[in-house]
């Protein structure tokens, strides 16, 4: 038999035995001569390398390009294909030799004590157990264990072929741990080697190359690429590689199974590609493919081969970096080079080392950039092999958003004396300097400073309706001075001033400075203060047995030591206002009262609570506050009247009425009493419910019935009630006329 493509100039090697199959007996000598037209080699079973001691290959004595293969005392194991071929070509002639050894009918692999057969549990798959025969026409069965089962060729799916082995559907032996072939010759049984049964799958989870990317070498270095396929259990894998220089003389491929942990649901296979000394032609894409038969997965990596070690900066390397204070700055080193260079950073010529604020390396990272980080940074790349150096300078400019100096010094609220002239200042530091500073204002009462509404500590005012200072209607008269520039603490700062001609109104003022990287603002609370103030809670005059609170509110930046007193029975002026000096001077004559103090952001409030007020609680109450600076006392008086309790009374009577259908009824029910009574209406002793025709107004005092209907006829009651009892009046309304059905109804 001949294999290979016919060549234009070469005939196939010619064998001395012109047969496809040769059958000889064991212990005889096998001798085959091969003649051809150029250098020849022999390949024979069980030994592909030619190192078998029993086999002799000799040059023929009678001519060139002739070799004789001789095996004395052949054994069954010598059964197989004998191939004579031209070196470095596919042109070959083959003869299959059966060495009939009835004592050893199965060919055993020289090295194997046992074999392995991989199967799937799938019914569609057959498996070949490679128990080849030294005799072509044996009666062979397959034994599987445990439990022991015997399978006999059935002329269909179960068969034995001396050149191939025993073929059987894989599921039939998937239960077995091992199988072997058995031949019967003259009532004697002969067994092949044992084959361990391994059940295989097909699914490949992934194929991973390492190094996975950025593989770089220079000419002459060794390339090692590992390709790992992760599969489900019981998978067999074929690996293949695709690479630029496929005619590689010094390429090595090693495939092996990796040990997996017991209990693992995965199997790993490794294929390693090694090229001992790469050349420029080895540069390119390397692809590894793993295949189980039903699934193929691939992965690729690019291998770059450089002529020699080198280093250079990449085109994307920055020369100017701009940043804002507080930001994280990253200056990546963009370089081209092999092997990767050593990187050193310098600032203004001084080497930089990594610490908690700066990280140096492939990227210079400044965690929180500050003004002092401004400067020139030099990065020097050194090739570790050639020692070639390259340097590059990066200028870092750090911008500062406007910062207003006074912001950190002021308390959230300042107080200003009524009627005085005041100057408000904003001193701004910014890089670059602010391109404008604007002033705005807002009435204090329009922007309550309550902690729950506070936006931030530095700006506790949640106000939004800011007005430009040019529009000072309803506020204080204002003048904005031209900005000035000053060197303060070694920094160039911009100073903006606002002059308030007369402090008449409490307001908030805001200066806002803007530059290219941000804005800064300062809110100034311009609180105009006079003396303390008394209010009543609730603000109506109390009735006896009700509770009332007297609140004394004083600006806490101006006043302290708030105290409540009550005047004795001697008469006092009735008007509200500051008491004459003698009262403030002679506080010993007054009764000091227990009170509770509360504070908000601007005021102290001293609350004196009267629970179940009585007529004896009537009189004049004095709140005393002391000026924080001058220590002068300010006294304010408030007269408290307690009303007597009066049971409800209804003034005037309800009158019976006769009205026609469709007309309107209007009646009033006026009640008095202390506390003021609640008024309710009833019709035929049931609460009157408002609807489109029945309207109650003025705290139920006025009842109107529009478009009167027949069903509105009845007894109407007005009842006035309080905790002291009830009063009521009644009237009967008669409705005349026939009911008309209208569309409106």
């Amino acid at each position: 038999a001949s294999v290979g493509l016919p060549s234009v100039s070469l005939d196939l090697p010619r064998l001395s035995i012109q047969k496809d199959i040769l059958t000889i007996k064991a212990n005889t000598t096998l001798q085959i001569t091969c003649r051809g037209q150029r250098d020849l080699d022999w390949l024979w079973p069980n030994n592909q390398s030619g190192s078998e001691q029993r086999v002799e290959v000799t040059e023929c004595s009678d001519g060139l390009f002739c070799k004789t293969l001789t095996i004395p005392k052949v054994i069954g194991n010598d059964t197989g294909a004998y191939k004579c071929f031209y070196r470095e070509t596919d042109l070959a002639s083959v003869i299959y030799v059966y060495v009939q050894d009835y004592r050893s009918p199965f060919i055993a692999s020289v090295s194997d004590q046992h074999g392995v057969v991989y199967i799937t549990e799938n019914k569609n798959k057959t498996v070949v157990i490679p128990c080849l025969g030294s005799i072509s026409n044996l009666n062979v069965s397959l034994c599987a264990r445990y439990p022991e089962k015997r399978f006999v060729p059935d002329g269909n799916r179960i068969s034995w072929d001396s050149k191939k082995g025993f073929t059987i559907p894989s599921y039939m032996i998937s239960y077995a741990g091992m199988v072997f072939c058995e031949a019967k010759i003259n009532d004697e049984s002969y067994q092949s080697i044992m084959y361990i049964v391994v059940v295989v799958g097909y699914r490949i989870y992934d194929v991973v190359l390492s190094p996975s990317h950025g593989v770089e070498l220079s000419v002459g270095e060794k390339l090692v690429l590992n390709c790992t396929a992760r599969t489900e259990l019981n998978v067999g894998i074929d690996f293949n590689w695709e690479y630029p220089s496929s005619k590689h003389q010094h390429k090595k491929l090693v495939n092996r199974d990796l040990k997996t942990q017991s209990g693992s649901e995965m199997k790993k296979f490794l294929s390693t590609l090694t090229i001992d000394g790469v050349t420029r032609s080895d540069q390119g894409l390397y692809t590894c493919a793993a295949s189980s038969g039903l699934m193929t997965k691939k992965n690729s990596t690019f291998v770059r081969v450089h002529e020699k070690p080198f280093v250079a900066f990449g085109s994307g390397m920055e020369s100017l970096v701009e940043a804002t204070v507080g930001e994280r700055v990253r200056i990546p080193v963009k370089y081209l080079g092999y092997p990767p260079p050593e990187i050193k950073w310098y600032k203004n010529g001084i080497p930089l080392e990594s610490n908690h604020t700066v990280k140096v390396g492939h990227v210079l990272t400044i965690m929180e950039v500050s003004e002092r980080d401004t400067g020139n940074y030099t990065v020097i790349l050194t090739n570790p092999i050639s020692k070639e150096k390259q340097s590059h300078v990066v200028s870092l400019v750090v911008y500062v958003p406007p910062q207003i100096g006074e912001k950190s010094l002021i308390s959230p609220v300042d107080s200003y004396q009524y009627g005085t002239t005041q100057t408000l200042t904003c001193t701004v530091y910014a890089i670059p300097p602010p391109h404008h500073i604007h002033w705005y204002w807002q009435l204090e009462e329009e922007c309550p400073n309550e902690p729950s509404q506070a936006v931030s500590v530095t700006n506790p005012y949640p106000c939004e309706e800011w007005r430009s200072v040019e529009d000072f209607q309803g506020g204080n008269k204002i003048e904005v001075n031209k900005n000035q520039f000053a060197l303060i603490e070694g920094k160039n700062k911009t100073v903006s001033t606002l002059v308030i001609q007369a402090a008449n109104v409490s307001a908030l003022y805001k200066c806002e400075a803007v530059n290219k990287v941000g804005r800064g603002e300062r809110v100034i609370s311009f609180h105009v203060t006079r003396g303390p103030e008394i209010t009543l809670q609730p603000d109506l005059q109390p009735t006896e047995q009700e509770s009332v609170s007297l609140w004394c509110t004083a600006d806490k930046s101006t006043f302290e030591n708030l105290t409540w007193y009550k005047l004795g029975p001697q008469p006092l002026p009735v008007h509200v206002g500051e008491l004459p000096t003698p009262v403030c001077k002679n506080l010993d004559t007054l009764w000091k009262l227990n009170a509770t103090i509360f504070s908000n952001s601007t005021n102290d409030i001293l609350i004196m609570e009267l629970k179940n007020a009585s007529l004896q609680d009537q009189g004049d109450y004095v709140c005393v506050a002391q000026d924080r600076k001058t220590k002068k006392r300010h006294c304010v008086v408030r007269q408290l009247t307690v009303l007597e309790r009066v049971a409800p009374m209804i003034t005037g009577n309800l009158e019976n009425q006769t009205t026609s259908i469709g007309e309107t009824i209007e009646v009033s029910c006026t009640a008095s009493g202390n506390p003021p009574p609640q008024i309710m209406w009833f019709k035929d002793n049931e609460t009157l419910v408002e609807d489109s025709g029945i309207v109650l107004k003025d705290g139920n005092r006025n009842l109107t019935i529009r478009r009167v209907r027949k069903e509105d006829e009845g007894l109407y009651t007005c009842q006035a009630c309080s905790v002291l009892g009830c009063a009521k009046v009644e009237a009967f309304f008669i409705i005349e006329g026939a009911q008309e059905k209208t569309n409106l109804e």
């Epitope: 067999g236 690996f239 649901e265 493919a289 038969g293 193929t296």
Partner: antibody, heavy 117, light 112 residues
Framework: EVQLVESGGDLVKPGGSLKLSCAAS????????MSWVRQTPDKRLEWVAS????????YYADSVEGRFIISRENAKNTLFLQMNSLKSEDTALYYC??????????WGQGTTLTVSS | HIMITQDELSNPVTFGESVSISCRSS???????????LNWFLQRPGQSPQLLIY???TRASGVSDRFSGSGSGTDFTLEISRVKAEDVGIYYC?????????FGSGTKLEIK
């Protein structure tokens, strides 16, 4: 451009044999699993056989197991299907298909096998 | 084997409309790796099958975004929006979760 060209289809008597070939071009043949899929006259698609990139692992459908042999010759970018003991139910249009990740991403135009007496 | 069931014909559709083609599997195609191994193919008249969708919802290279796949473990849908003349043909689904890989019987897309 990926191309798969099947050939070898013919009219065969039941019990006969035939070998189909599929010539591949436009890609690295040895880096892909290959399969044969057939389309019956009623337009149903049926997977027939698959082979791993190196040819070590082969899989067959129940209906062809033991009768068909899939093989490949990577050096010649060719896939084969040796069909023996042919039956009338093997009559179909036979496609060769390239496989990656289990998916048949490219198919040939097909070659027709008719099994009839 | 895993059985794949498809309706023989889709509801006739007008150009520009959307159409859904369904496919049912006798067993869940959700594998333990979290992926659903279902593919969709289109066979245009006189041509060989072309892979449209793999892993239930991933479009194959060069496939129009008018095609989208969805489903659960056993019920799957191929949605074609704004149907064009070139969408006419037989649509096959195929399971890859268990060997042997099986195809559905195909659904013919009809145009009104």
């Amino acid at each position: 451009e990926v191309q798969l060209v099947e050939s070898g289809g013919d009219l065969v008597k039941p019990g006969g044999s035939l070998k189909l070939s599929c010539a591949a071009s436009g890609f690295t043949f040895s880096m892909y699993g290959m399969s044969w899929v057939r389309q019956t006259p009623d337009k149903r698609l049926e997977w027939v056989a698959s082979i791993s990139i190196g040819g070590s692992y082969t899989y067959y459908a129940d209906s062809v197991e033991g009768r068909f042999i899939i093989s490949r010759e990577n050096a010649k970018n060719t896939l084969f299907l040796q069909m023996n003991s042919l039956k009338s139910e093997d009559t179909a249009l036979y496609y060769c298909a390239r496989e990656l990740d289990g998916n048949y991403d490219y198919w040939g135009q097909g070659t027709t096998l008719t099994v009839s007496s | 084997h895993i059985m794949i069931t498809q309706d023989e014909l889709s509801n006739p559709v007008t150009f520009g409309e959307s159409v859904s083609i369904s496919c049912r599997s006798s067993k869940s195609l959700l594998y333990k790796d979290g992926k659903t191994y279902l593919n969709w193919f289109l066979q245009r008249p006189g041509q060989s099958p072309q892979l449209l969708i793999y892993l239930m919802s991933t479009r194959a290279s060069g496939v129009s975004d008018r095609f989208s796949g969805s489903g659960s473990g056993t019920d799957f849908t191929l949605e074609i929006s704004r149907v064009k003349a070139e969408d006419v043909g037989i649509y096959y689904c195929q399971q890859l979760v268990e060997y042997p890989f099986t195809f559905g019987s195909g659904t013919k897309l009809e145009i009104k």
